[in-house]
């Protein structure tokens, strides 16, 4: 964005922000704008929150159109109350082995993550907290309405998927590289982030992906067959360009995305790749931003839920990228 | 009643100075840019610079970058616009203006201060 | 970017209708896509006072015989039915670009 021509904001009155977001001049110190916050895009017109000592991550110069809301190097995180250096490793439940980075935190399950679809033998699988156990074992329900149980079933196939092994040496390096987090929208183009020590000198970085689960303009439900409560991954009908801060890719793509549920159930990505997509935005410039594409959805009733702190962020997380 | 009252001009020689400015009332100062705009005798008007909420951006005519300067006083209200080595082609009626800074620029003008450079 | 008008004068009888029209040297659209493209009436030994911005949009408390119009590098101002409180300077001013400029001025009398 060219700061060089005259201010002019937008026609409605200056935005009123979320509690704890502060009101900040755009990048061109033109008009006010509520700061994106940790882990949000950001462009020069969009900027991050200078207050919680926040910057713009452009990454390479080549890609200095948007960015990823990071946080200054040595920043310390605040996790379930507690504050940790950067660079802290802290486990944060018997579930999770987390790790502070520059204001941002990446755990890792200690548990099996597996995500188990339905099944002839267990049509209904359910994690359930077994007492004197920290992990969460699966179990199969009875079905409650025995119709829904029929042909359809052989469909269905047992599909476990595993993080990266956390215990990868190499050269003297103990490799880590935590889970994709979940991405930062529900639909629409969002972020994903994850840490990792898997470089040349073994030290944690913090790696980000655009992500889309879904577009936000689909009527998904719509698309549910009669007597059926989901749609796993819903065929988009024609190829795709994405769209990012009114950049353009320069491909199209026919891509997956996760459908939905009628039940209370969710549908995620269960496998996913990351791939380069280059954008080309209005005045002509190129930028490559890594994006990650859906290989397979799961729906599941393991929805974030809000009693455990990490529990509600991490089932949303994407397993088994292939990346 | 929204009101701009402009203040501080007056005869001066070639090469002095002058410190023009603008009080404002009826409106939440902070939350619109402000401008000054002037008139040479007989002529039509010309933008001189604008400066946004709270001063960290000033935008000048590229020819009194130099010697201009516009500030402001978001604690008292107020706009000012500090002339340096002024000439006599600086000779005008000094507008203070509000800018809303969105749909439209100068909505509220000021009655005006007349500088005058002469020897 | 310099602004053009014409007529430079423009002596109408009341009730008529006055056009006056304002040519700019390039293209106003500012990069957000708006045309910052304004109207302003400064009336004998008054301080201007804003009329139309945004090419089409009239300021609060603007009479609706006041319209205007175009697009690109023309536009046009119009007074459908001219009063006598009308007289005076009309200014067009672009704030697309730097720098701001207004355009030299059309007198409108009254015949």
């Known amino acids: 964005q060219n700061c060089s021509g005259p201010c002019r904001c937008p026609d409605e009155p200056a935005p009123r922000c979320p509690a704890g977001v502060s009101l900040v001049l755009d990048g061109c110190g033109c008009c006010r704008v509520c700061a994106k916050q940790l882990g949000e895009l950001c462009t020069e017109r969009d900027p991050c929150d200078p207050h919680k000592g926040l910057f713009c991550d452009f990454g390479s110069p080549a890609n200095r159109k948007i960015g990823v809301c990071t946080a200054k190097d040595g920043a310390p995180c605040i996790f379930g109350g507690t504050v940790y250096r950067s660079g802290e490793s802290f486990q944060s439940s018997c579930k999770y082995q987390c790790t502070c980075l520059d204001g941002a935190v990446g755990c890792m399950p200690l548990c099996s993550m597996d995500v188990r679809l339905p099944s002839p033998d267990c049509p209904f699988p359910r994690r359930v907290k077994l007492p004197g156990k920290c992990c969460e074992e699966w179990v199969c329900d009875e079905p409650k309405d025995q119709t829904v149980v029929g042909p359809a079933l052989a469909a269905y196939r047992l599909e476990d998927t595993f993080g990266p092994d956390p215990t990868m040496i190499r050269a003297n390096c103990l490799v880590q590289t935590t889970e994709w987090s979940a991405c930062s929208k529900t639909c629409g183009m969002g972020i994903s982030t994850r840490v990792t020590n898997d470089n040349a000198s073994c030290r944690l970085e913090k790696q980000s992906r655009l992500c889309m689960v879904r577009p936000c303009e689909a009527d998904l439900e719509e698309n549910i067959k009669k007597g059926k409560k989901c749609i796993r991954t819903p065929k988009i009908s024609k190829p795709i360009k994405f769209e990012l801060s009114g950049c353009t890719s320069m491909k199209t793509y026919r891509a997956k995305f996760c459908g939905v549920c009628t039940d209370g159930r969710c549908c995620t990505p269960h496998r996913t790749t990351t791939l380069p997509v280059e954008f080309k935005c209005p005045d002509g410039e190129v930028m490559k931003k890594n994006m990650m594409f859906i290989k397979t959805c799961a729906c599941h009733y393991n929805c974030p839920g809000d009693n455990d702190i990490f529990e509600s962020l991490y089932y949303r997380k994407m397993y088994g990228d292939m990346a | 009643e929204v009101q701009l009252v402009e203040s501080g001009g007056g005869l001066v020689q070639p090469g002095g100075s002058l410190r023009l400015s603008c009080a404002a009332s009826?409106?939440?100062?902070?939350?619109?840019?402000m401008a000054w705009v002037r008139q040479a005798p007989g002529k039509g008007l010309e933008w001189v610079a604008n400066?946004?909420?709270?001063?960290?951006?000033?935008d000048l005519l590229a020819s009194l970058k130099s010697r201009f300067t516009i500030s402001r006083d978001n604690a008292k209200n107020s706009v000012y616009l500090q002339m340096n080595s002024l000439r006599a082609e600086d000779t005008a009626v000094y507008y203070c203006?509000?800018?809303?800074?969105?749909?439209?620029?100068?909505?509220?003008w000021g009655a005006g201060t007349t500088v005058t450079v002469s020897s | 970017v310099v602004m053009t008008q014409t007529p430079l004068s423009l002596s109408v009888s009341l009730g008529d209708q006055a056009s006056i029209s304002c040519k700019s040297s390039q293209s106003i659209v500012h990069y957000n896509e708006k045309t910052y493209l304004e109207w302003y009436l400064q009336k004998p030994g008054q301080s201007p006072q804003l009329l139309i911005y945004?090419?089409?949009s009239r300021a609060s408390g603007v009479p609706d015989r006041f319209s205007g119009s175009g697009s690109g590098t023309d536009f046009t101002l119009k007074i459908s039915r001219v009063e006598a409180e009308d007289l005076g300077v009309y200014y067009c001013f672009q704030g697309s670009h730097f720098p701001l400029t207004f355009g030299q001025g059309t007198k409108l009398e009254i015949k």
């Open positions: 945004k090419v089409s």
């Open positions: 400066i946004n909420y709270y001063g960290s951006r000033t």
């Open positions: 203006a509000r800018d809303t800074s969105r749909g439209s620029y100068f909505d509220v």
């Open positions: 009826g409106f939440t100062f902070s939350d619109y840019y």
